[in-house]
Amino acid sequence: GCLTQLYENAFFRGGDVASMYTPNAQYCQMRCTFHPRCLLFSFLPASSINDMEKRFGCFLKDSVTGTLPKVHRTGAVSGHSLKQCHQISACNKDIYVDLDMKGINYNSSVAKSAQECQERCTDDVHCHFFTYATRQFPSLEHRNICLLKHTQTGTPTRITKLDKVVSGFSLKSCALSNLACIRDIFPNTVFADSNIDSVMAPDAFVCGRICTHHPGCLFFTFFSQEWPKESQRNLCLLKTSESGLPSTRIKKSKALSGFSLQSCRHSIPVFCHSSFYHDTDFLGEELDIVAAKSHEACQKLCTNAVRCQFFTYTPAQASCNEGKGKCYLKLSSNGSPTKILHGRGGISGYTLRLCKMDNECTTKIKPRIVGGTASVRGEWPWQVTLHTTSPTQRHLCGGSIIGNQWILTAAHCFYGVESPKILRVYSGILNQSEIKEDTSFFGVQEIIIHDQYKMAESGYDIALLKLETTVNYTDSQRPICLPSKGDRNVIYTDCWVTGWGYRKLRDKIQNTLQKAKIPLVTNEECQKRYRGHKITHKMICAGYREGGKDACKGDSGGPLSCKHNEVWHLVGITSWGEGCAQRERPGVYTNVVEYVDWILEKTQAV
């Protein structure tokens, strides 16, 4: 299970798989969590040891039994990997005062504040962490200097105490980078830049995900199983370059290349490789061999075994072993197979334990029901219905689950709402008629309306609801991904508006959640249709030229959901429009990508 406790003045003996320098025990624990083999860690703060080489030492450990002997060591801190826990995040916004984190300093410039320095690091493709000399720093030339740093491992090469400086990490893994997301995979292409690492992968998608969570990888080349050179088949080459982009692209059949999705990793699965690979054997260190009825059962066994990283299932030969096949549970030093073989009849895959490390919003949901306007249960699991209880209980607006305590909706929904006490959020609802006196709901602790909001038509029509209790994610209630700032140029082609709103201007709230597929409209086109209004870049429009399908009264605050690369993104919030579904009058939505910083600032505030 999930073990969160830390052991003070304790050090785990033996089991070392890696060591590094980290600024504190919490960051050491996070590195352990994201390391393919680490189950336990021990950290030595500066105060705990005289040996300068070992100060801030973070020791990652593995154990066959899941535990190691603890020895007393004054000041040391030990604990467990959080691999078994839900909602793990690599995001670390902490600023470390009077610590100099050493690495390769590849850029120095003047910055007004540590925050500006951290933003610069976040928006620089190479930057892993930074050190900023404050204006109190004794060296005149060094005052206000922001040093951007990187290392092979993404962690400092040393950490030392230094007065009047602050250090911190890039916030790329917090979804705060403005760097572009290039999601395309380029067929028949080899990037001819320097390799920083290589691993075996079953396909280019897994290769891309490995690149995304590898600290030095900016782009990759994958050689498929049809690649002519046998020794290089299924080889995933992790690459970098000084410019951050490939210097040369070579046309080569049976190779595929692509880019790290580091700056948009919150809205794609990075650790979770859920596919099965048929007629494929993964080689690695064998952990166990167990009987299993199917490859799905084998994957479950691997997921439940904390040290298992991947598996190969050999189906049963006719009438053997009660129809059960052999499930080989495996691991390696880097979490990837040491070799991949084809044509031997095995079915292979990866543990789903690491899916917990990805944002829950990237989980695949039920296939969409094509046709019809009524939704089915679990089709839009992020959609909520927001009710007011004053003067009587009724549906007020839609909203979207974006975190386990957060609903994103429209600001205009709260006109005349005096207190969050009168609000109820119902999730996992298909029909309004399901809501009875005893139906469980989430109370609202706080309504956060954008402070620049005046009226829907002038923009900033966005609000957050902080729930009193947390949402347990299930198939019928789970979050939708926010778009990445690096995705501003993505052209979404599969967008849907959902809600219980009116079907025509003079109507009533619908019982069943309605859905409509609606194309996005350019802001230029939208501006032509609304000459009396200013359509800003913070708005996004959608609708058919001939009308007929649109959001309407009661849909406000609900999602404009767009599917991109198998992941649903909250592209818009239903805001305003002229009438409903009128010809040449598209619906106007709050353009969520423009508010990602605001959302994260409010939801991640300590």
């Epitope: 100099d100 050493k102 300093n105 120095s108 003047v110 004794p138 060296s139 005149l140 030339e141 060094h142 206000n144 200097i145 040093l147 030392t160 230094l162």
Partner: antibody, heavy 121, light 108 residues
């Protein structure tokens, strides 16, 4: 490649003035802090003045020259200057202009070949 | 102002020798120490920055160590071109930048 070329040195009487120039090339001059450092004959190095790149008012001087010397720069021409007034015999030295680079810590990573200033009656 | 004291002021050594020059700061300067080499009639040249980092293009026989107040420059195997004057310099508490008085390395 980075080049710094000083000029303007010579023999001058005590109390008189002299203006040294340093022509920079091979780097983005406006982005870097620039220094003057001097070395009296047979002696060690003595720092004279700095002009910070990011703040036009940030000029700092060694106590020994404060009030007499003025450092200035012309970013449009990639030039650094040292205006030396009320010169004294102890100002006799080779004057170097040097580019500063933050290589983890501030360093003087490139120096000119120097120009000799002799203050003598 | 921080004072920098080098020792020895001068030393004689032979080609192939291992040579160590020390530099002491009057107060802690962390690792904000640089070493320069100067040959007669030439400008100084940066050898080591941040106490122990080798400037690009400088031979690996040069190394630096230390932190706080005590620092050393080591030449592992003296070459004929290494005979010069060496200066340490602090850039921790500035202005002013201060240099050591220099160490003259001569052929024995």
């Amino acid at each position: 490649q980075v080049q710094l070329v000083e000029s303007g040195g010579g023999v001058v009487q005590p109390g008189r003035s002299l203006r040294l120039s340093c022509a920079a090339s091979g780097f983005t001059f406006s982005s870097y802090n620039m220094h003057w450092v001097r070395q009296a004959p047979g002696k060690g190095l003595e720092w004279v003045a700095i002009f910070l790149s990011y703040d036009g008012s940030n000029k700092y001087y060694a106590d020994s020259v404060k009030g007499r010397f003025t450092i200035s720069r012309d970013n449009s021409r990639d030039m650094l200057y040292l205006q030396m007034n009320s010169l004294r015999a102890e100002d006799t030295a080779v004057y170097y202009c040097a580019k500063s680079e933050i290589l983890v810590v501030p360093t003087l990573d490139y120096w000119g070949q120097g120009t000799l200033v002799t203050v003598s009656s | 102002d921080i004072q920098m004291t080098q020792s020895p002021s001068s030393l004689s050594a032979s080609v192939g020798d291992r040579v160590t020059i020390t530099c002491r700061a009057s107060q802690s300067i962390s690792s904000y120490l640089n070493w320069y080499q100067q040959k007669p009639g030439k400008a100084p040249k940066l050898l080591i920055y941040a106490a122990s980092s080798l400037q690009s293009g400088v031979p690996s026989r040069f190394s630096g160590s230390g932190s706080g107040t005590d620092f050393t420059l080591t030449i592992s195997s003296l070459q004929p071109e290494d005979f010069a004057t060496y200066y340490c310099q602090q850039s921790y508490s500035t202005p002013p930048i201060t240099f050591g008085q220099g160490t003259r390395l001569e052929i024995k």
